[in-house]
Amino acid sequence: LRLLDHRALVCSQPGLNCTVKNSTCLDDSWIHPRNLTPSSPKDLQIQLHFAHTQQGDLFPVAHIEWTLQTDASILYLEGAELSVLQLNTNERLCVRFEFLSKLRHHHRRWRFTFSHFVVDPDQEYEVTVHHLPKPIPDGDPNHQSKNFLVPDCEHARMKVTTPCMSSGSLWDPNITVETLEAHQLRVSFTLWNESTHYQILLTSFPHMENHSCFEHMHHIPAPRPEEFHQRSNVTLTLRNLKGCCRHQVQIQPFFSSCLNDCLRHSATVSCPEMPDTPEPIPDYMPLW
């Protein structure tokens, strides 16, 4: 988790002098509770936006927006703590809006936005906005939270972001797999425009089961420049096991931008359809 560009972040708006500060996610009001605290944010909304860095890179960011309730507690509102928690790693990043002037009611509802938290493809986040100071112990909560999931690099709009392109999202191998005679699979895919090696991972399964009955790895050396964007054809020999008929072929590239953590592509061959054969009728009837 990080902030997009560490240029001056702005939270001031007409009628409010405000500054954005790094936060430890542990506001002082936890330790030194105040008697009078503001009410919670209203209408918290989290959206996925895309933003360019000063270097021209494109990143997905969490666009956070909320409004204030129209009650007298805004007189005690000193700022807000914005927290983003990545759910699978428990990593948290916070910033603090520090109000340098007192808020007053005006003809429009106060609205705040922040779009500088960079988020990762295929990750889920909990976004919380806490009004400051935080409430006394047992006081009514004055925060609002929402979870949101970022699409993965297969998504059309995500595909062109810098983190996705770095992991090889623009490569479309267009994998085809066909079953040949004599327990063989023919795998064909399009090479990318980089002199890097590939690995084909074959995993076979019995019909309708998820534990593998055969695994095989095949190394493909780095292509020469004249082979870029050409089709690579590989024939894999299968283990002669009856019923080990569903094959998943996964191609792992080793591009320089992502090394051994590049996006993998896969294709699956289903088991052949079994004709419905009627149960044979016994020509004698057992007596027991």
């Epitope: 929402k146 979870n147 709009r157």
Partner: nanobody, 127 residues
Framework: QVQLVESGGGLVQPGRSLRLSCAAS????????MHWVRQAPGKSLEWVSG????????DYADSVKGRFTISRDNAKNSLYLQMNSLRAEDTALYYC????????????????????WGQGTMVTVSS
């Protein structure tokens, strides 16, 4: 123009099944997460289920978990809700809704994250 049209509602006996459909047009359907929301007579809106753009993530309200299944067919620009073991308390107007942005609201009150709603299809569960 951007439009969502629900169908498949009707009168059904308790314990029976129904399949709702939602046809989308006017936007790139497979870019967005979609949701089902319902409103029982005299009650407020209740989120029912959500599905991410590629069906990789599906979520359900506790009240329908194990009975309802959400699915989508991006090739047909369609969203579905398979409702099994229907109960009287499932009686409501069912709406499909599109998320405003490309993310997927996976918890918290999500209704304000939707920008396009259908006109709804009525489901009545009664013997």
């Amino acid at each position: 123009q951007v439009q969502l049209v629900e169908s498949g509602g009707g009168l059904v006996q308790p314990g029976r099944s129904l399949r709702l459909s939602c046809a989308a047009s006017g936007f790139t359907f497979d870019d967005y997460a979609m949701h089902w929301v319902r409103q029982a007579p005299g009650k407020s809106l209740e989120w029912v289920s959500g599905i991410s753009w590629n069906s990789g993530r599906k979520d359900y309200a506790d009240s329908v978990k194990g009975r309802f299944t959400i699915s989508r067919d991006n090739a047909k620009n369609s969203l579905y809700l398979q409702m099994n073991s229907l109960r009287a308390e499932d009686t409501a107007l069912y709406y499909c809704a599109k998320e405003k942005s490309l993310g997927y609201c996976s918890s918290g009150p999500c209704s304000d994250a939707f920008d396009i709603w259908g006109q709804g299809t009525m489901v009545t569960v009664s013997s």
